[in-house]
């Protein structure tokens, strides 16, 4: 017997659609191979319809699609606009028709549910408002208008012009008669629930001569979208539910057992603690749309979503809705990355962001995470040499190592910088990652004078001092711009007696500027790193005076000023704008970048965990 | 709470016929899945049937075990799903559940029990050789 599985029988109506799903074995094989349905003839054959490999019979074409979830181990056949012609037997299978595994199905489409002749049909979606139009002739214009629905064999009244509304519809029926004019009433429902479709019946006056009028209503569930993304990637929920709800609070929810939606995120500021640091709501439009990006996707995470409006900020009754069916593919395109880095106060973090690496020309970014309202991403810096004011001097993002990896190095940590951050592109959204960045008791392990002044004309010696933990690493001087930092020569002056219990492992090594000028002002960097990965740094400023009295300066630890957890950057910058990304494609509005920079000198940055992986500041 | 309550088991021959109802309670599912389990002594539980519905359009499921001589339906007003047993076999003597889920989007695997979020008490069948 075949292990594929899936329905025996289908059975729907004209215009429907019908969502078919084959199960197999998710095998290596099996995942990879062809998935086709086919419609079998009178003499045996069975010819394809559809399948995996892009075909699409013209009998379908612009009608059918066929997902194959590898993860999940089943492969669905979408067809819309079914007609009675569709009606027949099939197979959905793996591999070659004749021979391969398939399982049986029987579609039959009928035409129709049974409507009273001059039967009106009304087709809505769960939540939103339908019209039913009740005309009615003249002799019956001072007469009780009324709507029933037909329960069983009985009609039930619903609602009339002397004022009764049925309890399952109060606050969201009317009945409206039209002016003079016209010579028919309408009854708006709104908030259409699933439980309102069946037939109706509308009547003006109350003896034999009144005038009636059937009414077919169907309540339409939302089918899911599928949605099929990769572990650690990242998934966007676009919602669109249309202007009469754009005042409405919005929410996504997961759904859980039975008809229960958990809260995922809502605009009334509430949020799943399993998404803290990796889920943003954009700013709706007016129109009502909204979306909600999810990163650092998890196994956990794969089920069904739904999107809605509701005054409560989650699923009721006649929420107008939208859904998903997440797949969260675990053989995923996105390698692993630590998602918490730990450093130390005054100390440093370099975080690893990988990327497409088929879009290594595209612009990187890193942007903070912030909480509150709807959570926001402020930019902080950016491969084109932007980097916003206060992190002047500590932040920096480079390219390296390259080959779907870049390295943003963060120093002179305080407390404050503890948070969510996110690595992203302008390129393949799928590809946004989170970090959690924590700040862990510990001193930093290099060792540099605080800030340093220069004599213009003079020479100065700069030290820095690296543990023997760091013996096997290169270190290295730059000078930091907003482009990067760019290596400078140094000095090694032999083992440093700055470290207790450390051996001749130790070093001290010297950035010596020779005949300083006002261009050597600026932040200097001591760091270490093996190859293209880049492990602590540490900071210092250089401010160039006036000379005052003749020499070269060598500045030594002792001289250094206020600890790192003191230093306030740019504190007398006035604050420029205040603009949170809501791109570069965070949500696939294609906003251009540059207008979307956040220059506020207040806020800070952020990035978000997916597993408990966890990086120190220094190791790679 | 929805509550599933079978009925139709008893004593039958090899060869014959039974039909099994399962009524819930509440409000008409407008989408959902309902459907049939059974456990006989010292055996795990295992899947039957199940009909999902959504509008105006059904899916029905069986397993090999039961193809043929099976047949599940539902009768949408009165909020109940029937499994019609034809050809009962000895190795068909069982405890029959009946399994519901309600839900606006269509769940996953029919035949795994963990896609159902109400069971009935069950009802035995014996098919007796």
């Known amino acids: 017997k075949s292990p594929i599985f899936g329905p025996e029988e289908v059975n729907s109506v004209e215009g429907n659609s019908v969502s078919i799903t084959c199960y197999y074995p998710p095998t290596s094989v099996n995942r990879h191979t062809r998935k086709y349905w086919c419609r079998q003839g009178a003499r045996g054959g069975c010819i394809t319809l559809i399948s995996s490999e892009g075909y699409v019979s013209s009998k379908y074409a612009g009608r059918a699609n066929l997902t194959n979830f590898p993860e999940n181990g089943t492969f669905v056949v979408n067809i819309a606009q079914l007609s009675q012609d569709d009606s027949g037997r099939y197979k959905c299978g793996l591999g070659i028709n004749s021979r391969g595994l398939s399982f049986d199905v029987s579609l039959e489409v009928s035409q129709g549910p049974g409507l009273l002749n001059d039967t009106k049909v009304y087709t809505v979606d769960l939540g939103r408002t339908v019209t039913i139009n009740c005309p009615f002739k003249t002799e019956n214009a001072q007469k009780r208008k009324s709507l029933y629905k037909q329960i069983g064999l009985y009609p039930v009244l619903v609602i009339d012009s002397s004022g009764y509304v049925n309890p399952n519809y109060t606050g969201r029926i009317r009945l409206d008669i039209q002016g003079t004019g016209q010579l028919l009433f309408s009854v708006v429902i709104n908030q259409l629930r699933l439980s309102d479709a069946g037939q109706y019946l509308c009547q003006a006056g109350d003896d034999s001569n009144s005038n009636k009028k059937n009414a077919d209503l169907q309540v339409l569930k939302p089918e899911p979208e599928l949605v099929y993304e990769d572990l650690r990637g990242s998934v966007t929920f676009h919602c669109a539910l249309g202007p009469e709800v754009a005042n409405v609070a919005k929410f996504l929810c997961r759904q859980s057992s039975g008809e229960n939606c958990d809260v995922v995120v809502n605009t009334l500021g509430k949020r799943a603690p399993a998404f803290e640091g990796r889920i943003l709501l954009n700013p709706q439009d007016k129109d009502g749309s909204f979306s909600v990006v999810i990163t650092g996707l998890r196994k956990e995470d794969a089920g069904r979503y739904l999107c809605g409006a509701h005054s409560d900020g989650q699923l009721q009754e006649g929420s107008p809705i939208q859904a998903w069916q997440l797949f969260v593919n675990e053989e995923s395109t996105i390698p692993r990355s630590p998602t918490v880095v730990k450093g130390v106060a005054g100390g440093s973090v370099a975080v690893l962001c990988p990327y497409n690496r088929k879009e290594s020309k595209s612009i990187k970014y890193w942007c903070l995470w912030e909480g509150a309202q709807n959570g926001r991403c402020p930019l902080l810096v950016d491969s084109e040499g932007w980097v916003k004011a206060q992190y002047e001097g500590r932040l920096s993002l480079l390219e390296e190592p390259g080959n779907g990896t870049f390295t943003v190095i963060l120093n002179q940590l305080t407390s404050r910088d503890a948070g969510f951050y996110w690595c992203l592109t302008n390129g393949d959204t799928l590809w946004r990652t989170t970090v959690e960045i924590k700040i862990i008791e510990g001193e930093p392990n290099l060792k540099v004078p605080g800030n340093v002044t220069a004599v213009l004309g003079e020479t100065l010696k700069v030290p820095c001092h690296f543990p023997c933990k760091f013996s096997s690493y290169e270190k290295y001087w730059c000078k930091w711009n907003n482009t990067g930092c760019q290596a400078l020569p140094s000095q090694d002056e032999g083992p440093s007696k700055a470290f207790v219990n450390c051996d001749e492992n130790s070093r001290l090594v010297s950035l010596t500027l020779n005949l300083v000028t006002r261009a050597d002002e600026g932040w200097y960097w001591c760091g270490v790193k093996q190859g293209h990965f880049y492990g602590e740094t540490a900071a210092v400023y250089v401010a160039v005076e006036e000379r005052k009295a003749a020499g070269s300066r060598d500045v030594s630890l002792a001289k250094a000023d206020a600890a790192p957890d003191e230093k306030v950057l740019d504190s007398g910058f006035r604050e420029i704008e205040n603009k949170a990304i809501q791109d570069p494609r965070l949500f696939a509005e294609e906003k251009a970048v540059a207008d979307t920079r956040d220059q506020a000198d207040g806020s800070r940055a952020s990035v978000d965990s997916g597993s408990s992986e966890e990086q120190g500041g220094s190791s790679r | 709470q929805v509550q599933l309550v079978e009925s139709g088991g008893g004593l039958v021959q090899a060869g014959g016929s039974l039909r099994l109802s399962c009524a819930a309670s509440?409000?008409?599912?407008?989408?959902?899945?309902m459907g049939w389990f059974r456990q006989a002594p010292g055996k795990e539980r295992e899947f039957v049937a199940a009909?999902?519905?959504?509008?105006?359009?059904?899916?029905?499921y069986y397993a090999d075990s039961v193809k043929g001589r099976f047949t599940i339906s539902r009768e949408n007003a009165k909020n109940t799903v029937s499994l019609q047993m034809n050809s009962l076999k000895p190795e068909d003597t069982a405890v029959y559940y009946c399994?519901?889920?309600?839900?606006?989007?269509?769940?996953?695997?029919?035949?795994?029990?963990?896609?159902?979020?109400?069971w009935g008490q069950g009802t035995l069948v014996t098919v007796s050789s």
């Open positions: 009909i999902s519905w959504s509008g105006h359009t059904t899916y029905k």
């Open positions: 399994a519901a889920r309600q839900s606006l989007v269509a769940g996953g695997d029919p035949r795994g029990q963990s896609e159902y979020d109400y």
């Open positions: 509440g409000r008409a599912f407008s989408s959902g899945r």
